[in-house]
């Protein structure tokens, strides 16, 4: 599906990816002032020895000398079940039994900036993507993924951490945003809404999608997540929107079929290795990129976000399974686990393709107001 306010409902079906350029180029309505934009806090937790929460529970990466680059995931924080998205939700919550940054939820007190000042930063995520205003940067080359096709063994840890479902990835998954911009994948997790209620974190022209996948990476320039936090380019997240299509997505089914086993908050299971790249769109050449932050406390900035233009299609049943199986803290369903979009504050979103050119015959003259910052040069 095209990301931008698609005018067609013609899913590709089958494979992991959706149609061609979802985020593309149509006339999407903006909803800056809508209730959807009320800060439903982000949710991701990073680890490190200092209990740093972030894009879900990020693993601590030890220097190769210590353990041949193995990733150790410390379950630092847990985001509590999403609150009512009608209420402002840029809030963090300190659980009785946790320390300062261990337990979070969507909605509630205290406000996130009180828990982590970075959450009030100027360059936060997620954001609303406006293709017409994106700067076309020919220097943004197709993403390169290496080692993402995992064998069944060793198995991987799939965990309900109370604010998402997270798959911890083994060493060896390499990703390059461009020459000299190399990363290692740490984990992936999802954000979703509820039936009839969209739950992606990023939006396109104000349009929120049913769900969103995040694959979190650590720059090879750093040995540990806590060293990379807040450093420009220290972390990179690949993000893709999930939409409803007519057929079951076999790649996602390998994870979704196991969710019942981890329905309870804090529970985990082991799943056979799979092709992680099959969870992403097939077109690695068309994407949007900007510098933002983790979408949950500590909301560390300097994170490079790459949002695919193509979407991934899941069946209605699969989306329902995703949003209706897991439970968060207390007796609340784990749903609507997304943070509201944050202001760009002067940031320019770059596009690897001319996203400002609307293919629709209804479009007026193409608008390309922003120029490329030559990322990657």
């Amino acid at each position: 599906q095209r990301l931008p306010r698609m005018q067609e409902d013609s899913p590709l079906g089958g494979g992991s990816s959706g149609e061609d350029d979802p985020l593309g180029e149509e006339d999407l309505p903006s909803e800056e002032d809508s209730p959807r934009e009320e800060d439903p806090p982000g949710e991701e937790d990073l680890p490190g020895e200092e209990d740093l929460p972030g894009e879900e529970d990020l693993p601590e990466v030890k220097p190769k000398s210590e353990e041949e680059g193995s990733l150790k995931l410390e379950d630092l924080p847990t985001v509590e079940a999403p609150g009512d998205p009608q209420e402002p939700q840029n809030n963090a919550h300190r659980d009785k039994e946790g320390d300062d940054q261990s337990h979070w939820r969507y909605g509630g007190d205290p406000p996130w900036p009180r828990v982590s000042p970075a959450c009030a930063g100027r360059f936060q995520s997620p954001v609303d993507i406006r293709p017409q205003l994106a700067a076309f940067c020919p220097a943004l080359r197709p993403l390169e993924l290496l080692g993402f096709q995992l064998p069944p063994l060793p198995e991987l840890r799939l965990r309900n951490n109370g604010h998402s479902v997270q798959l911890t990835l083994p060493p060896g998954l390499e990703m390059a945003l461009g020459p000299g911009r190399e990363y290692r994948a740490l984990q992936l997790h999802l954000h979703w809404g509820a039936a009839g209620r969209p739950g992606s974190e990023h939006t396109v022209e104000g349009h929120r999608f049913p769900a969103e996948i995040h694959v979190v990476h650590l720059s090879t320039a750093f040995a540990r997540v806590d060293e990379a936090l807040g450093r420009p380019g220290g972390l990179a997240v690949l993000a893709a929107f999930l939409e409803e299509g007519p057929e079951e997505n076999s790649a996602y089914e390998q994870l979704l079929s196991r969710l019942e086993e981890i329905a309870e908050e804090g529970s985990e299971t082991q799943v056979p290795g799979l092709d992680i790249s099959a969870l992403l769109p097939s077109d690695f050449s068309r994407y949007f990129q900007y510098e933002g932050s983790l979408t949950t406390p500590p909301c560390a900035q300097g994170v490079i976000w790459t949002v695919f233009n193509q979407t991934v299609m899941l069946s209605a049943k699969q989306l329902h399974t995703l949003s209706d199986t897991l439970w968060g803290p207390g007796d609340s369903r784990l749903q609507l686990n997304f943070r509201a979009t944050q202001p760009l504050n002067g940031r320019v979103i770059e596009a690897s393709f001319p996203a400002g050119v609307d293919s629709s015959p209804r479009a007026a003259e193409p608008v390309q107001l922003n120029s490329c910052l030559a990322a990657g040069d």
Partner: antibody, heavy 116, light 105 residues
């Protein structure tokens, strides 16, 4: 395609069982809605059933009187209507329910008339 | 629960643009869908998920959802577009469909 059947004339307090036969898609992959429309009135949600049939939902106006069920082996949806009232008179539609909340495929409807 | 409010009728000259509104609290938190229903026929989904057009629906149909109002826009309205139009969404109660009262175009 969805095809409803079982409608007809019934007296107040009586019962009726509606069926909805599905074809052309994997029935067990979709939740299904029953929606009704009284003569000259708008659309009104009646009931919904999940893929497997394990979860069911009802509008307050029919709760306790109507029962929704499905037989995935027969690709058929049912609505058992008991203690019928005059205000239940309507055309009853079954509709395939998408995750997003929309219904992209509807049956042609079957008329239920409750009158003495 | 959420209530959807539509104007009872909207009139427009052929070839002009028709706009049908649907209002409800916190509407952008939900996907809004639009159905067209002609006399004696079953409803047909014309706009899904706020603004998506199912295959077979003419390009003149479009939708938006922001603030507390969703809007169905029919540009270059044709005589065949004369029908009742219903907006729909989920209620706050899980798996509960809600319909607007309908608008006769």
């Amino acid at each position: 395609e969805l095809v409803e059947s079982g409608g007809g004339l019934v007296q107040p307090g009586g019962s009726l069982r509606l069926s909805c036969a599905a074809s052309g898609f994997t029935f067990s992959d979709y939740s299904i809605n029953w929606v009704r429309q009284a003569p000259g009135k708008g659309l009104e949600y009646v009931s919904n059933i999940s893929y497997s049939g394990s979860s069911t939902y009802y509008a307050d106006s029919v709760k306790g009187r109507f029962t929704i069920s499905r037989d995935n082996s027969k690709n058929t949806l049912y609505l058992q209507m008991n203690s019928l009232r005059a205000e239940d008179t309507a055309v009853y539609y079954c509709a395939r329910f998408k995750y997003s909340g929309g219904s992209d495929s509807w049956g042609q409807g079957t008329l239920v008339t409750v009158s003495s | 629960d959420i209530e959807l409010t539509q104007p009872p009728s909207v009139s427009v000259a052929p070839g002009q643009t028709a706009r049908i509104s649907c209002s409800g609290d916190n509407l952008p938190d939900f996907y809004v869908h639009w159905y067209q229903q002609k006399p004696g026929q079953a409803p047909v989904l014309v706009i899904s998920e706020d603004n998506k057009r199912p295959s077979g629906i003419p390009e003149r149909f479009s939708g938006s959802n922001s603030g507390n109002t969703a809007t169905l826009t029919i540009s270059g309205t044709q005589a065949e577009d004369e029908a009742d139009y219903y907006c729909s969404t989920y209620g706050y109660t899980y798996s509960y469909s809600v319909f607007g009262g309908g608008t006769k175009l």
